[in-house]
């Protein structure tokens, strides 16, 4: 028996359902009584879900997994993982045994989009050219860690005096805070770009500093 899985990692958004595809080619006359199917975590060998002795043995993994019982006889051994969490990320191995056995691993990459950045300025009044200001760009509840980039109004990247920190909350999602320290010119626009490297999702924030009231 030959087991086939997706070459590419499966990307799943937090709180959505993911399907880890696994298939085999059943011989003519194949019946489910012959099938032993085991899904396990590749690294720890922890059992996730199994189908043995002709029946679904159920989820051994936080009761959030399911097979596709009507499709098993056609060789579809895929696993459904419900309400995906950050902690589900990793490699899963699909073992199929009929007369002989084969296995293959599929990677699950968990992701969550970042919120539109909020911009804060310190100090935020009585600003004059030549003043040193601190601009903070904050974006929330994303996964995995973001990449943060700053640029000025002409689109020139700003890499000096940038400090970016990322903190994971109890769900494993990151809040990112990036601080740019800059000396004000007469007028200036400063933009931050928060990029999710897995979703390839960009979130933009900017602040324009003029002689007039600030605009965000």
């Amino acid at each position: 028996v030959e087991v086939q899985v997706s070459e590419d990692p499966v990307v799943a958004l937090v709180d959505t359902d993911a399907t880890l595809r696994c298939s085999f080619s059943p011989e003519p006359g194949f019946s489910l009584a012959q099938l032993n199917l085991i899904w396990q975590l590749t690294d720890t060998k922890q059992l996730v879900h199994s189908f043995t002795e002709g029946r679904d043995q159920g989820s051994a993994y936080s009761n959030r997994t399911a097979l596709f019982p009507d499709l098993l006889v056609q060789g579809n051994a895929s696993l459904r993982l419900q309400r995906v969490r950050v902690t589900d990320e990793g490699s899963y191995t699909c073992f199929v045994s009929i007369q002989d056995f084969d296995s293959a691993a599929v990677s699950l990459q968990v992701a969550a989009p970042y919120s539109k950045p909020s911009m804060t300025l310190e100090p935020n009044k009585d600003l004059r050219p030549g003043n040193m200001v601190t601009i903070t760009c904050s974006s929330y509840q994303g996964y995995p860690e973001a990449e943060v980039f700053w640029k000025d109004g002409q689109g020139v990247p700003l890499t000096g005096n940038v400090t970016t920190s990322q903190m994971a909350n109890e769900r494993g999602l990151f809040d990112v805070h990036s601080v740019l320290r800059v000396v004000l010119g007469a007028n200036g626009t400063y933009s931050c770009l928060v990029r999710n490297p897995v979703l390839q999702q960009d979130a933009h924030g900017s602040v324009t500093i003029t002689g007039q009231p600030l605009t965000f």
Partner: antibody
Framework: QVQLVESGGGLVQSGGSLRLSCAAS????????MSWVRQAPGKGLEWVSV????????YYADSVKGRFTISRDNSKNTLYLQMNSLRAEDTAVYYC???????????WGQGTLVTVSS | QSALTQPASVSGSPGQSITISCTGT?????????VSWYQQHPGKAPKLMIY???NRPSGVSYRFSGSKSGNTASLTISGLQAEDEADYYC??????????FGTGTKVTVL
């Protein structure tokens, strides 16, 4: 100015190990992702691995997964590549590169040559 | 993780314009606007010429420009000069935060 300097390359037997280092200066190292890219003699560029600014997220090319480990020490502004179970096909110049511009490697080190003899 | 496809060589006379193509799939070039281009002279480290399809870093000549259509990205060098003779590589994000390079193109100034 931004500078990256690699070290640790050399000649190693097939199956052996080597640890490459990349010392960074001129930018806030901990705020940016870093990559290793390699180039076999007379061949093209091949991406090897990337690590996030804090070191919490790491990704690898299939060709090195399970054998190479990328890491960083932000207190020392240094990037590392631990290479185990080396093969002849790992022979290459290894470059470290910074991601201080979106989606690209804007600053590169001078490279360090790793030669794996069989 | 197959390499992106580039022509092995492109040549032009001084002052001419040349274009280098970089063809991938919807899983890399076609799927994201994160294509970058690098110039590499013999024995030297690569140098970033274009990022995010069509953005030029400061210090890179205006003669270099990038574009993308579907699964193919392009680098155009206008007003070709002797110092442009080098190898050029495209690169793209691909699935799950991985990256992939092109096969490389040798540019010859006739």
């Amino acid at each position: 100015q931004v500078q990256l300097v690699e070290s640790g390359g050399g000649l190693v037997q097939s199956g052996g190990s080597l640890r490459l280092s990349c010392a960074a200066s001129g930018f806030t190292f901990s705020s940016y992702a870093m990559s290793w890219v390699r180039q076999a003699p007379g061949k093209g560029l091949e991406w090897v691995s990337v690590i996030s600014g804090s070191g919490g997220s790491r990704y690898y090319a299939d060709s090195v997964k399970g054998r190479f480990t990328i890491s960083r020490d932000n207190s020392k502004n240094t990037l590392y590549l631990q290479m185990n179970s080396l093969r002849a096909e790992d022979t290459a110049v290894y470059y470290c590169a910074s991601h201080t511009i979106p989606g690209a490697w804007d600053v590169w080190g001078q490279g360090t040559l790793v030669t794996v003899s069989s | 993780q197959s390499a992106l496809t580039q022509p092995a060589s492109v040549s032009g006379s001084p002052g001419q314009s040349i274009t280098i193509s970089c063809t991938g799939t919807t899983r890399d070039v076609g799927g994201y606007n994160y294509v970058s281009w690098y110039q590499q002279h013999p024995g030297k480290a690569p140098k970033l010429m274009i990022y995010d399809v069509n953005n030029r870093p400061s210090g890179v000549s205006y003669r270099f420009s990038g574009s993308k259509s579907g699964n193919t990205a392009s680098l155009t060098i206008s007003g070709l000069q002797a110092e442009d003779e080098a190898d050029y590589y495209c690169s793209s994000y691909t699935t799950s935060s991985r990256r992939v390079f092109g096969t490389g193109t040798k540019v010859t100034v006739l």
